[in-house]
Amino acid sequence: QPVESFPLDFTAVEGNMDSFMAQVKSLAQSLYPCSAQQLNEDLRLHLLLNTSVTCNDGSPAGYYLKESRGSRRWLLFLEGGWYCFNRENCDSRYDTMRRLMSSRDWPRTRTGTGILSSQPEENPYWWNANMVFIPYCSSDVWSGASSKSEKNEYAFMGALIIQEVVRELLGRGLSGAKVLLLAGSSAGGTGVLLNVDRVAEQLEKLGYPAIQVRGLADSGWFLDNKQYRHTDCVDTITCAPTEAIRRGIRYWNGVVPERCRRQFQEGEEWNCFFGYKVYPTLRCPVFVVQWLFDEAQLTVDNVHLTGQPVQEGLRLYIQNLGRELRHTLKDVPASFAPACLSHEIIIRSHWTDVQVKGTSLPRALHCWDRSLHDSHKASKTPLKGCPVHLVDSCPWPHCNPSCPTVRDQFTGQEMNVAQFLMHMGFDMQTVAQPQGLEPSELLGMLSNGS
C-alpha cells in the first residue's frame, strides 16, 4: 500500500515564522521514532543513463539527488569552478582539477549544505524541497554543446547536461513539480542566466507548462569592465573576461539564450554571458545574489589583495567597481547585494547570517516566492515588510557589519571592519565625512559591529 503523503506549501505562512518552525520541528521530532528510514542528509549520485551526454573527458555526466516526496518544489543547483578556453589551459586543468572535467572519481554521495540542506535551521527557505546538485564537469560556464571527437580532444556539453538532467528527473518525480528553481554559484550562477529560459522552454515542449521555472544566480553576475591592470590573455585567471569568453564560445560551441543572441551580431554572443546584458532578455523570474566586491570579479580584473596596504588608485578602482555593480542591479527587482568582499554564498552553511537593510537572504527569497505567488494580482508594489530588492548603498567593502569575517591574509587573525578598512588604505576622515561623523565615532561604530 503506498504511503500517504501530505504536500505542505509554506509560501503562505506568515506571522511568527519562529513559532511556526518550532511547531514543525516538534512535530518532526515526535514522528521521528515512527520512521523506519533514518534522516539522511546525503544526496546520492546518479550518472546519466544517456551516456552520450558527457563531461569533458567523455565520462558520463550526472547529478546528486535527495528526494523529498511530500514536496512539489525542486531545487537544481549548478556547481561553479571557473572554465578553460583553449587546449593548453584545458590540458592543465585536466591534470590538476580533474573532478571538474571527469566523473571518474566522483564520490557516491554529497552532503547538502546551505540552500541544499534539509535542516530547517540551516535552510529556513526551502529545507523541504527535492534537492539536486549538478557537478560542473564541462568547463564551459554551462554553455557548451559539442561532443568529443577526432577533432575535439574534449567535450563541452554544459547546456546539454542541464537538459538531460531535467529529462531524467521527470521520471523521478519532477513531472509533478509546482516550482523548479535553477540555482548556481559562480560559473554556475552565470549558467543559470544562460539556461533558465531554455529549461522552461524544454518543459513546455515536453508537456509540462504548469511547472514554474525560476532562477537564482549567485556570484555569477560579472562585469565586462576595464581591468585594473591589463594583462595578455595567457591563462584563465589573468585573461580579461570578455576575451576569455570570446575565445571560449568558439572552443566550446557555446549556446546563449535565443532572445539575447538576437540582440547581438554574429560573433558578439559573448555579451550574453554578462548578467546586466542577458537579464533584460529573460522571461523567467530570476533572483540575483552578488557581492558588490566579488573576489572572482577582482581576480579577472587583476586585483590581488595580498595583505599589503592598498594604494589610492586601487582603492578608488575597488570603490568604483562596487558603484558600477550597484548600478547594474538598479532595474533588477529581485536582488541581494551586500557590500562585502567575498565570493559565493548560497551553499555555505552560514548563508543565513548576512543581512542587507536588516533582511537575510533566506527571508528575501521567501518574500520573492510570495511576490511571485501573488503576482497574478495586478499590484506591482512590493509586499509590506517583505523586501526583495536589497542592495547595499554604503560605498566600501565590509561597510555592512554582517559581512562574512575577514581574516588577515598572513596572520590568519580575524579583523574587524575598522581594521580591514585601515588595512585597505581607507582614510577614516574620507570614509566618515559622507556619513556626517567624526572618524573616532565611525571607528567606534565599526568596531562594535554597528
Partner: antibody, heavy 119, light 111 residues
Framework: DVQLLESGGGLVQPGGSRKLSCAAS????????MHWVRQAPEKGLEWVAY????????YYADTVKGRLTLSRDNSKNTLFLEMTSLRSEDTAMYYC????????????WGQGTSLTVSS | DIVLTQSPASLAVSLGQRATISCRAS??????????IHWYQQKPGQPPKLLIY???DLESGVPARFSGSGSGAAFTLNIHPVEEEDAATYYC?????????FGSGTKLEIK
C-alpha cells in the same frame, strides 16, 4: 609500486646538449601530468617544465624556454627532457615528478639525475 | 607568475616544541573551495617528500604532528611536537596555474 627513475645526467661542456629520461612504472602513465624540477647545488627547488597527460601541451619556465624540449612516449611510459645550449647555471640535480590530478601536487618523485655543465 | 615567499629562511626549535613556517603568495592560490598550496620535506641527498597537499590535507603515512593551514595567499606549516628526524628543509609549492613555483625553502634545525 609507483616508481620514477631518471637517467642521462653526467658532465657536459657549456653549449653542449643532453637528453634526460624518466622511466615510470607501477601506474597508468598516460593518466598523469608529468613535471621536471631541478635543484642547483646547495640551492632550492626550481620548477622547470610540464607535459600534459596526453603529451599535447608542454610548458616551460622562462629560465629554460627555447633551450629545452619536453616530450613523452606514453606507450613506453617514458618522459624525456632534451637540453641544448647548456650553461653552467643549468648544473643541478634533475628530478622527474608525477602530479596528482586532484590538485597538481607532486605525490611521487624520482631519485634524480645529476647534470654538470663545465669545461 | 605567482611568487611564493617563505619565511623564516632557517629556524632552530627545541625537541618537543612547535615549528611554524609561513608561505605567502603574490596573489590568491585558492579557487572553488580549494587552496593549491602544498608542502614538501627534503633531507640531504634525497628527493623531496610530499607532506601536506591542498593546504591542509595530510599525505598518507605522514605523522599527524605535521599540519597545514591557510587560504587565499597566506599559508602555514606547523610541526608539533618537533622530533629529531624532522631536521630538514621544507618547501611550499603552488599548482594554481602554470608556471608552478616553489618557495625558497626553510631549513629546520633541532636544538
Amino acid at each position: 609500486d609507483v616508481q620514477l627513475l631518471e637517467s642521462g645526467g653526467g658532465l657536459v661542456q657549456p653549449g653542449g646538449s643532453r637528453k634526460l629520461s624518466c622511466a615510470a612504472s607501477g601506474f597508468t602513465f598516460s593518466d598523469f601530468g608529468m613535471h621536471w624540477v631541478r635543484q642547483a647545488p646547495e640551492k632550492g627547488l626550481e620548477w622547470v617544465a610540464y607535459s600534459s597527460s596526453g603529451g599535447t601541451t608542454v610548458y616551460y619556465a622562462d629560465t629554460v624556454k627555447g633551450r629545452l624540449t619536453l616530450s613523452r612516449d606514453n606507450s613506453k611510459n617514458t618522459l624525456f627532457l632534451e637540453m641544448t645550449s647548456l650553461r653552467s647555471e643549468d648544473t643541478a640535480m634533475y628530478y622527474c615528478a608525477r602530479a596528482s590530478y586532484d590538485g597538481g601536487y607532486f605525490d611521487c618523485w624520482g631519485q634524480g639525475t645529476s647534470l654538470t655543465v663545465s669545461s | 607568475d605567482i611568487v611564493l615567499t617563505q619565511s623564516p629562511a632557517s629556524l632552530a626549535v627545541s625537541l618537543g616544541q612547535r615549528a611554524t613556517i609561513s608561505c605567502r603568495a603574490s596573489k590568491s592560490v585558492s579557487t572553488s573551495g580549494y587552496s593549491y598550496i602544498h608542502w614538501y620535506q627534503q633531507k640531504p641527498g634525497q628527493p623531496p617528500k610530499l607532506l601536506i597537499y591542498l593546504a591542509s590535507d595530510l599525505e598518507s603515512g605522514v605523522p599527524a604532528r605535521f599540519s597545514g593551514s591557510g587560504s587565499g595567499a597566506a599559508f602555514t606549516l606547523n610541526i608539533h611536537p618537533v622530533e629529531e628526524e624532522d631536521a630538514a628543509t621544507y618547501y611550499c609549492h603552488h599548482s594554481r596555474e602554470l608556471p608552478f613555483t616553489f618557495g625558497s625553502g626553510t631549513k629546520l634545525e633541532i636544538k
